[in-house]
Every structure is written in C-alpha cells, then in structure tokens.
Interface confidence: medium
Amino acid sequence: EDGGPACYGGFDLYFILDKSGSVLHHWNEIYYFVEQLAHRFISPQLRMSFIVFSTRGTTLMKLTEDREQIRQGLEELQKVLPGGDTYMHEGFERASEQIYYENSQGYRTASVIIALTDGELHEDLFFYSEREANRSRDLGAIVYCVGVKDFNETQLARIADSKDHVFPVNDGFQALQGIIHSILKKSCIEILAAEPSTICAGESFQVVVRGNGFRHARNVDRVLCSFKINDSVTLNEKPFAVEDTYLLCPAPILKEVGMKAALQVSMNDGLSFISSSVIITTTHCSDGS
C-alpha cells in the first residue's frame, strides 16, 4: 500500500456502480476509483460486494471477505462494458437481497452502500431509486452517493442518507481520485481500541471506545455499544457520550476472571453491528488496587 489512509472497520461494504451507456468512455476511471478504495478497507472482518447497474442490476461479486475473491472481483469489474439505461434502483435491489439474506442467516453485520452514478435520473427512475434505497436503509444500511458530471445533487441527497452523505465530483471522472480520502473518512466506521482493555472482575466500569465515524449514524441516539461475552451472550449498552472518534460506554459487569468481551458498535439501535478485533478481558483486582 502507499501509506494512504485506511479503514479498519469490520462491516459489509457494497459498491453499486453505474455502467449505463453514458459512462462508456469513463469506465477505467470508475474501476480505478473502486480499486483504490477497496484496498483501503483492510479489516479481515470487512466483507465487500460489487454490483453494477444499467438496464438491469447485476451482482458481479457477492459479499466476501476473501481477499483473493476480491482481487478476482476487481478483475471482473475491469472487464465491464458499459451500455444501457440508468436503473439505479436495480443496484439497490441487488444489495438489499444480500443484506436480507445475511440478516436471515443470523449475521447482523452493519452494511454500508457506496452508490456511484453520472447524470440525472429520469423522474420515473428516480422514484424507484429512492424507494429501493429506503428499503436498503430499512434493512439497516447506511447509504452514500457519489455523483459525477451531470448528476442532480437534490436527487442524490434523497437517495443517500442525507446531503452530507453525497460526494459531488463536479470536475468529471478524472477527479474521482480526489475524493477517495474524503469518502474513506466519511464512510469508515471503525473501532480501534478500548480504554481500559482490562477490567476488574465483578466491578462496574466505564469504557472509552476509540475509533472513527461514530457520528455517521443517521441518528446518534441510536448508537449502541455492544459486548459479546465469551462468544455467546451479547449485551447492548447506551453510551453516555457519542463523538466522532470515541464513545463513552458503561461496561457490563463481568463476574469471573478471564472472561472476554468482544467490542461491537451498532449505529441503528442493534439492527446491525460494526465488528472489531478489540477485546476487553477481566482480571482479579485485590482490594485497594
């Protein structure tokens, strides 16, 4: 890697990419943008899917954390030949199908969608696109939109979670590279550390969860700290404070020495979770220590 910014968050990332006729001469720039971005999400728990849409939506690469499959998926993406109409809603349908399936399998992993389009959507198609984006949201997804060239920012603000979730690229496709840093910063929700990482068995504590993107939730009142204890029971706690780079959370009382709590964060009241490799463990604390 080039030492640029990276994201350590464990969530499901869906790229929904416009491959309609109007991007025919710019597919290389779209591909390169996705490739650069994909390589910056580096958590082993991050899964990725590539979806393309024109007159139909196609899942080019199903959700996977396998880096070899992602490499092959990128190769398939590079071979795409654009053509057809801008049925963006079909892209969201393909994402929602996967989110729904994952939820039904008991995986409540947070989903982030990055949808890229150029040009304004015909009103009939915009109607469907916004509705399908809302369905993805109802399944717990956070939706970002990248608009290139002749896009309608008002439309994209309604398809995305808000106007703050829209990345306008006004200078054409070659300028896509310039927004990689800001997309990464905004779309990345990651848990980096917990302080303290060791707590006393049987005692109540507060934990500072360090990370990024905690205020990217549509509603910060719906942010939860989640503790998966010994890979079985999950306890959700409402944080005392939610800032972009940290959460202040009550830690569950872990009665026995050696117990482990894996830290997760939900941005939507427990509908789905950002996973991490951060573990809180218990130790014996003598009186007065």
Epitope: T55, D85, Y87, E123, D124, L125, F126, F127, E130, R131
Partner: antibody
Framework: QVQLVQSGPEVKKPGAPVKISCKTS????????ITWVRQAPGQGLEWLGW????????SFAQKVQGRLTMTTDISTNTASMELRGLRSDDTALYYC??????????????WGQGTLVTVSS | DVVMTQSPDSLAVSLGERATINCKSS????????????LAWYQQKPGQPPKLLIY???TRESGVPDRFSGSGSGTDFTLTISSLQAEDVAVYYC?????????FGGGTKLEIK
C-alpha cells in the same frame, strides 16, 4: 389516433402454449410500454406483466412468472405475449394496453379490444 | 404486494344523483418527493375494454366528462360521479402503480336505481 389491435380468439388444450399479438399505431411505439391484463369470465382485472418497448425490460406477476414471455418488434410496432403450459383457469379475455412511461409501468391509457383464450380438453 | 380493496361491490344510484366509489390500498401509494399518488381509475362498460378515467388519483384523462372526479391521498381514494348519466352504467376499477406487481381493486358495479 392511438390504436391497439389484437389477434383473434384462440381455443387451446391444457398444457399447450398460446401466442397473442398486439399491433399498435398512431403513436411512437418506443415512447410507451406495453402491459398485458386478463379478465376471467365474470371476474375482475388481473395484471400479468409489462414490457418496455424502449429497452426490453420486463416485469411479471408472480402467478405467470416462468410461463409468460413478452416481446416487441419495433419494425412492425407490434407487441406479443406467449403463455405456456395452459391450464383451465387461464381461460380469459386477454388485453394489451399502452403504458404511460417508457421506463416504469404506470397507468394504462389505451387498450386493445381483447383476445378470448379458451382452454379446454 | 399492494392490495386494493374497493367498496361497495355494487351501487345503484338514481339518474342525476351523485355516485361515490371508494378504494383503499394496503399501503400508501403517495410518493413524498413529487407529492403524487400512484393511483388510477378505469371504467369498463359491458363487452368493452376498460377505459382510463383518472390518473395520479385526481387528474382527469382528456375527453373524460368533468362530472368524473378523483380525490384522496395515501391509502384512501374516492371516485365521484357528480350527476349520474345513463351511459355511466359500468364496472369501475382502481389500480395502483406505485410498485410491481401492479394491482387492481375488485371492481364496483354501478347501476341505475
């Protein structure tokens, strides 16, 4: 003026396919979609499917998904539907209609005269 | 699927009187962005194909007499014939086009009392 003229009545045996055509005139064919609706004797209207004459996109009712094929021929401004594996409950008057919007199935502003399909052994 | 329920099933009204037909959808067919209700009304006379009367819940199709009007929003809609004429005897259907599959109401048969 806008006209949709359908092919004549059909009597078919169970399991056979039926193909109905719908010849249009009086408007630009690929500016509007075509939908197919049927009406069993003495019953209400049942939507079967829609095709975009502009890009071939289709949408089907679950009941006929897999049995219904819809096609369009821009050179003759004609839409067709084929329903395979006919059953007795497919006996109905089949209508084609012009759909407002070339992209998405909306309301139906002109209708064909209907084609009666009778399925009987 | 969006289920459309019409009431009453049949209706007898005197000539010159007002006729009111109701249609209820199982979910809202109002789209907030353009404030349009994705609902149409059709008239079907015996032995004829249906004919579009009203679209976007309240817009009259060209050539439709102004005694026909549509109203309502969200899930509840009404077709009103302000002064019934003999030629209005027919079955009337509502239809939603908010989402596929497109669905029709069961129909209301309008007769003269």
């Amino acid at each position: 003026q806008v006209q949709l003229v359908q092919s004549g009545p059909e009597v078919k045996k169970p399991g056979a396919p039926v193909k109905i055509s719908c010849k249009t005139s009086g408007y630009i064919f690929d500016d509007y979609g075509i939908t197919w609706v049927r009406q069993a004797p003495g019953q209400g209207l049942e939507w079967l499917g829609w095709i975009s004459t502009y890009n071939g996109k289709t949408s089907f009712a679950q009941k006929v998904q897999g049995r219904l094929t819809m096609t369009t021929d821009i050179s003759t401004n004609t839409a067709s539907m084929e329903l395979r594996g006919l059953r007795s409950d497919d006996t109905a008057l089949y209508y084609c209609a012009r759909v407002f919007s070339r992209y998405i199935p909306f309301y139906f502003d002109s209708w064909g005269q209907g084609t009666l399909v009778t399925v009987s052994s | 699927d969006v289920v459309m329920t019409q009431s009453p099933d049949s209706l007898a009204v005197s000539l010159g009187e007002r006729a009111t037909i109701n249609c209820k959808s199982s979910q809202s067919v109002l789209y907030s962005y353009n404030n349009k209700n994705y609902l149409a009304w059709y008239q079907q006379k015996p032995g004829q194909p249906p004919k579009l009367l009203i679209y976007w819940a309240s817009t009259r199709e060209s050539g439709v007499p102004d005694r026909f009007s549509g109203s309502g929003s969200g899930t509840d809609f009404t077709l009103t014939i302000s002064s019934l004429q003999a030629e209005d005897v027919a079955v009337y259907y509502c239809q939603q086009y908010y989402s596929t599959p497109l669905t029709f109401g069961g129909g209301t048969k309008l007769e003269i009392k």
